[in-house]
Interface confidence: low
Amino acid sequence: DISEPPLHDFYCSRLLDLVFLLDGSSRLSEAEFEVLKAFVVDMMERLRISQKWVRVAVVEYHDGSHAYIGLKDRKRPSELRRIASQVKYAGSQVASTSEVLKYTLFQIFSKIDRPEASRIALLLMASQEPQRMSRNFVRYVQGLKKKKVIVIPVGIGPHANLKQIRLIEKQAPENKAFVLSSVDELEQQRDEIVSYLCDLAPEAPPPTLPPHMAQVTVG
């Protein structure tokens, strides 16, 4: 398993599949999008990223979805952080939360290959999709709930879709939202967000002894 020494005092060593969903709309300027990426990279520094512990995916969404990192990518954590830091700014007119949740449901979590791990989608949203695109929004959120995927919306700035955020929160008690006035607040909320995610994930069970090594005590 490819792992690296921890870079911070707080280090999340849990069983977790975490998907970062980045709003690629022009509601964020290119400089603001850089800060959003810095936040993602910073979060990744605080996770024990490996195929055994925390697996991560990074998706930028606009009218479609563009995956930069998949859960099964076997790369060093530093390389994954480098890839995340190079996500391209789309600056598109539309960023469809419905489309990216559909993508998360049917592409990323189509097969649950780690039932023992928690599944979380961190939805970083700064815009509102057009009404016509949001027809199946609730259906996708419910689909994710059925697959035990926790959706944590992070609303950023004045144009974040608060109605959708509230709908996500209503679906499950774990779907806790963070609403921030700008990207600059991400760094102040970083520790709270990462510890909340980490608390939702189980610790690895203690290693079980192979059958032939089981200890027998005779009374």
Epitope: L7, H8, A31, V35, A38, F39, V41, D42, S85, R190
Partner: nanobody, 123 residues
Framework: QVQLQESGGGSVQAGDSLTLSCAAS????????MGWFRQAPGKEREFVAA???????EYADSLKGRFTVSRDNAKKLVWLQMNGLKPEDTAAYYC?????????????????WGQGTQVTVSS
């Protein structure tokens, strides 16, 4: 690419104040978190303070209250104001920059480093 140049070091008495400056070159200064580290002879480099582009600050617990970090994005400058200096503050002080916008407290997370400026505090 970011080049960093520290200045302002020198020899002072215990209890004195000193302000270190770090001048940066490069167009992207306003996107980088900046940090100050120090290294005393025979010791490891240790974190002092850091500041993000939006002026969010972090300090080493032992230095809180005595040291203040600030920056001017337009002038591409970072300062470390040190008050109530003690002999144990004697060290080479280094300015560092991260590629990202978030502060960090460990040296390996910084991508660019200055040459350092010496601070000597005598009792």
């Amino acid at each position: 690419q970011v080049q960093l140049q520290e200045s302002g070091g020198g020899s002072v008495q215990a209890g004195d104040s000193l302000t270190l400056s770090c001048a940066a070159s490069g167009r992207t200064f306003s996107m980088h978190a900046m940090g100050w580290f120090r290294q005393a002879p025979g010791k490891e480099r240790e974190f002092v303070a850091a500041i993000s582009p939006s002026a969010f600050t972090e300090y080493a617990d032992s230095l809180k209250g005595r040291f203040t970090v600030s920056r001017d994005n337009a002038k591409k400058l970072v300062w470390l104001q040190m008050n109530g200096l003690k002999p144990e503050d004697t060290a080479a002080y280094y300015c560092a920059a991260r590629r990202g916008a978030f502060t960090a407290t460990t040296a390996p997370l910084y991508d660019y480093w200055g040459q350092g400026t010496q601070v000597t505090v005598s009792s």
